[in-house]
């Protein structure tokens, strides 16, 4: 089974664009676009801080931490209203991701 040029293996993703901007109040806002070839029952999400195909139920229920979106050793918490999640590093630094 050979992949054509530009074709993704089933269940995988690639980053298409990564924009960093607006360093306000010591905050960097990043917007990332990914291209995924997800299997039936999966949808594009984030695992270990990288684009990944995840169980579609996770997105439907907004249980974002079930994607394992944070790096190993970081703590994941849902934002109020399940609008996204935070990843807390051992040193206390917090990275917030909102889903739009």
């Amino acid at each position: 089974q050979f992949l054509k040029e530009g074709q993704l293996a089933a269940g995988t993703c690639e980053i298409v664009t990564l924009d960093r901007c607006c360093n306000k109040n010591r905050r960097t806002i990043a917007r990332q676009t990914a291209r995924c070839a997800c299997r039936k029952g999966q949808i594009a999400g984030t695992t270990r801080a990288r684009p990944a195909c995840v169980d579609a139920r996770i997105i439907k229920t907004k249980q974002w931490c079930d994607m394992l979106p944070c790096l190993e050793g970081e703590g994941c918490d849902l934002l109020i209203n399940r609008s996204g999640w935070t990843c807390t590093q051992p040193g206390g630094r917090i990275k917030t991701t909102t889903v739009s």
């Epitope: 089974q1 089933a10 269940g11 995988t12 695992t47 990944a52 249980q63 931490c65 079930d66 703590g75």
Partner: antibody, heavy 120, light 107 residues
């Protein structure tokens, strides 16, 4: 280094419920998926199910009507309940950590296994 | 369910030999294939994930290959500790299914 330890009764009577607990030490239970697998005597491995940090689950359809996997993050434990057991449920039961290696979910840390015999 | 079929079911070899175990999926699973080693009385041990990526701490004499429906595990220069049962497992669907196992013993 993460270690897993299964615990529970080694003998269960037919029609009763098999209950096992897996205690995770050396790491947070919230950072991975967790799984139960079993192996009947002299046979191969059978996947029972997964549990996610939120408590959401995926089960093997062949066992779905009888199985419940739950998690207690405060104790760093997850558990298996299998109801209405019969002799065919006699097996070594393993708990395992499921690691998302990029896109490839694999069970990279296993408990040593606990033998459960179903007999009256 | 995806069915995983291993061949052969058993295999006899000598220390120093090179052996290959095959695993076939009943439908395409891309490279979502893991290999485990199990010695008697012990828990399985992850050897390879993603069809070809060696798990940390696993000797380089182990290698995996394949994609789609056909996969292989190769051990070059067998060592005494390699005589065990090997299982493939797909991670592309629910339920996760294992092959029936290949028992490797000393000739």
């Amino acid at each position: 280094q993460v270690q897993l330890q299964e615990s529970g009764p080694g003998l269960v009577k037919p029609s009763e419920t098999l209950s096992l607990t897996c205690t995770v030490s050396g790491g947070s239970i919230s950072s991975y998926y967790w799984s139960w697998i079993r192996q009947p005597p002299g046979k191969g491995l059978e996947w029972i199910g997964y549990i996610y940090p939120s408590g959401s689950t995926n089960y093997n359809p062949s066992l779905k009507s009888r199985v419940t996997i739950s998690v207690d993050t405060s104790k760093n434990q997850f558990s298996l309940n299998l109801k209405s057991v019969t002799a065919v449920d006699t097996a070594v039961y393993y708990c395992a950590r499921v690691n998302p290696f990029g896109y490839y979910y694999a069970m990279d840390v296993w408990g040593q296994g606990t033998t459960v015999t179903v007999s009256s | 369910d995806i069915q995983m079929t291993q061949s052969p079911s058993s295999l006899s070899a000598s220390v120093g030999d090179r052996i290959t175990i095959s695993c076939r999926a009943s439908q395409s699973i891309s490279t979502s294939l893991n290999w485990y080693q199990q010695t008697p009385g012990k828990a399985p041990r992850l050897l390879i994930y993603g069809a070809s990526t060696l798990q940390s701490g696993v000797p380089s004499r182990f290698s995996g290959g394949g994609s789609g429906t056909d996969f292989s595990l190769t051990i070059t220069s067998l060592q005494p500790e390699d005589f065990a049962t090997y299982y493939c497992q797909e991670s592309a669907s629910i339920p996760r299914t294992f092959g029936q196992g290949t028992k490797l013993d000393i000739k």
